[in-house]
């Protein structure tokens, strides 16, 4: 059943009606629940298997939560006239697993996007920028939200994990306005390079509960505006001096490296003279060693040069098996 | 961060119009819903109505015959008109929005004007 | 319109005490209920939006719960800065209302 909280005063929406004349523009599709003074339908754990075909005019924040889409095709939220105040769209937990080239085109003011907690094993790399062109028409998206969209190792495709998401960043240098970014738990192993360098704009980057290894060849360089990194829950061992000037150069930029299993050898030098001296790193004085075993829990501020060493290589002939 | 600025006429007389303006600095109209509350003396709330970035408007039907609210995009100024007051209408108006958008770092701000204490008496 | 009453009116609590504020409406109003405080000679400032969410830069102290018709403002442990009048409001239907407010004095 419908439950509609808009003030408007149109007819109740009745199914077997809905195909016999074009949706009126202020009505509450079926199984939702809409708020015209709010700008707001919620469509929520209703096991819906598509986008609901009569969407209100009105609507700005739209949440498909915790439904069974499985397919987002191109086009899924195309209307006559187009939902041209959506802004918000929230289709997390949703079960899908497909994301379609041109699934949100023709939402011009859609700026936050959120398709966390979806297992997606194929995102179309024109996602997001709507065509196959080298440069697209930029994309209004201010917020992409895509935090644990890793499907399961049986429904990966052949290609990395990582690649296709980043393929569906840059496609068209559509996303040259994005802000925030999350991509929390993904089981990331590392960040392909050209994704930041296309993504100049970015406040917020969320890139937690990974498992990223190094950011040696990451460059943070152009992220000018960046206010705030999130890198906790990693595998970080230690972090090299180019990327330390690198965030040592960003203006505004907090970095979160909570919770990284680092390695407290001589490679850990620079990093520790870095902490010691910088504003960047919030709570930094939380950092502890993981490796070697004799300086497991070790915080990182405390430690000097000293402290640091590594064990000698031996040649081959005098290695033992 | 968004800041708002109120004025105008603060002692009307009976059968007159009320007009207040309220500007907006530091951010931007989009999103927001632009919205005119008044509380008379030692009483409660009461919202008169609002305007958005496309100029839709919703006014509270106890006023509806009464007012106008409109918004000045050029200037990022908005504006109250309420008509042939008497001394009902004497209360404190405020200007303020509420960013009505799921964004991250917006949703939920809410702001307000300092306040405009308002007299009806002849 | 819809209808929000407050209750109780006046909520008399010594600093540190446990601050429980009720606001119940006519209608649903699903979650679209906010919570402002306000002090005499000031505006109005939100603390929760969306009945449940705290407001940027809104202390822990404060939480809000409900949905639907009842609806529950609690303040944990009282500071001196919180003893203040109350107000909810709801944005699910035109027009938006206030409740009536509940005013929190020291004991």
């Known amino acids: 059943t419908s439950s509609a909280s808009s003030s408007s005063s149109s007819a109740p929406f009745l199914a077997s009606a809905a195909s016999a004349q074009p949706p009126l523009p202020d009505q509450c599709p079926a199984l939702c629940e809409c708020s015209e003074a709010a700008r707001t339908v919620k469509c929520v754990n209703r096991n819906l298997t598509e986008v609901p075909t009569d969407l209100p005019l009105y609507v700005r924040n739209l949440f498909l939560t915790g439904n069974q889409l499985a397919v987002l095709p191109a086009g899924a939220f195309a209307r006559r006239p187009p939902l041209a105040e959506l802004a918000a769209l929230n289709l997390s937990g949703s079960r899908l697993d497909e994301v379609r080239g041109g699934a949100f085109e023709h939402l011009p003011s859609l700026r936050q996007l959120d398709l966390s907690h979806n297992p997606l094993a194929y995102l179309s790399p024109f996602a997001f920028s709507g065509s196959n062109a080298s440069i697209s028409a930029p994309s209004p998206l201010v917020e992409l939200i895509l935090n644990h969209i890793v499907p399961p190792d049986d429904k990966r495709q052949n290609r990395s994990f990582e690649g296709m998401v980043a393929a569906a960043l840059v496609a068209g240098r559509a996303l040259q306005g994005l802000h925030l970014l999350e991509l929390a738990s993904n089981h990331f192993l590392y960040l392909p390079r050209d994704v930041l360098a296309q993504l100049p704009s970015l406040r917020y980057l969320d890139l937690s509960n990974n498992s990223l290894v190094s950011l040696t060849y990451v460059s943070f360089r152009n992220l000018t505006h960046l206010e705030s990194l999130h890198l906790e829950d990693n595998a970080l061992k230690v972090l090299h001096n180019g990327t330390l000037a690198e965030l040592q150069g960003l203006p505004h930029v907090r970095v979160f490296l909570d919770n990284n299993p680092w390695v407290c050898d001589c490679h850990m030098a620079d990093m520790v003279t870095w902490l010691k001296q910088t504003g960047v790193v919030q709570g930094k004085d939380r950092l502890t060693c993981a490796f070697p075993e004799k300086m497991r829990n070790r915080v990182l501020l405390e430690l000097n040069s000293a402290d640091l060493d590594c064990d000698p290589i031996l040649p081959p002939s005098l290695q033992t098996s | 961060q968004v800041q708002l600025q109120q004025w105008g006429a603060g002692l009307l007389k009976p059968s007159e119009t009320l007009s207040l303006t309220c500007a907006v600095y530091g951010g931007s109209f989009s999103g927001y819903y632009w919205t005119w509350i008044r509380q008379p003396p030692g009483k409660g709330l009461e919202w008169i109505g609002e305007i958005d970035h496309s100029e839709s408007t919703n006014y509270n039907p106890s006023l509806k015959s009464r007012v106008t609210i409109s918004v000045d995009t050029s200037k990022n100024q908005f504006s109250l008109k309420l008509s042939s007051v008497t001394a009902a209408d004497t209360a404190v108006y405020y200007c303020a929005g509420w960013f009505g958008e799921l964004y991250h770092y917006y949703y939920g701000m809410d702001v307000w004007g300092q306040g405009t204490t308002v007299t009806v008496s002849s | 319109e819809i209808v929000l009453t407050q209750s109780p009116a006046t909520l008399s609590l010594s600093p540190g005490e446990r601050a429980t504020l009720s606001c119940r409406a006519s209608q649903s109003v699903s979650s679209y209920l906010a919570w402002y405080q306000q002090k005499p000679g000031q505006a109005p400032r939100l603390l929760i939006y969306?009945?449940?969410n705290r407001a940027t830069g809104i202390p822990a102290r404060f939480s809000g719960s409900g949905s639907g018709t009842d609806f529950t403002l609690t303040i944990s442990s009282l500071e001196p800065e919180d003893f203040a009048v109350y107000y909810c409001q709801q944005r699910s239907n035109w027009p938006l209302t206030f409740g009536g407010g509940t005013k929190v004095e020291i004991k």
């Open positions: 969306d009945a449940s």
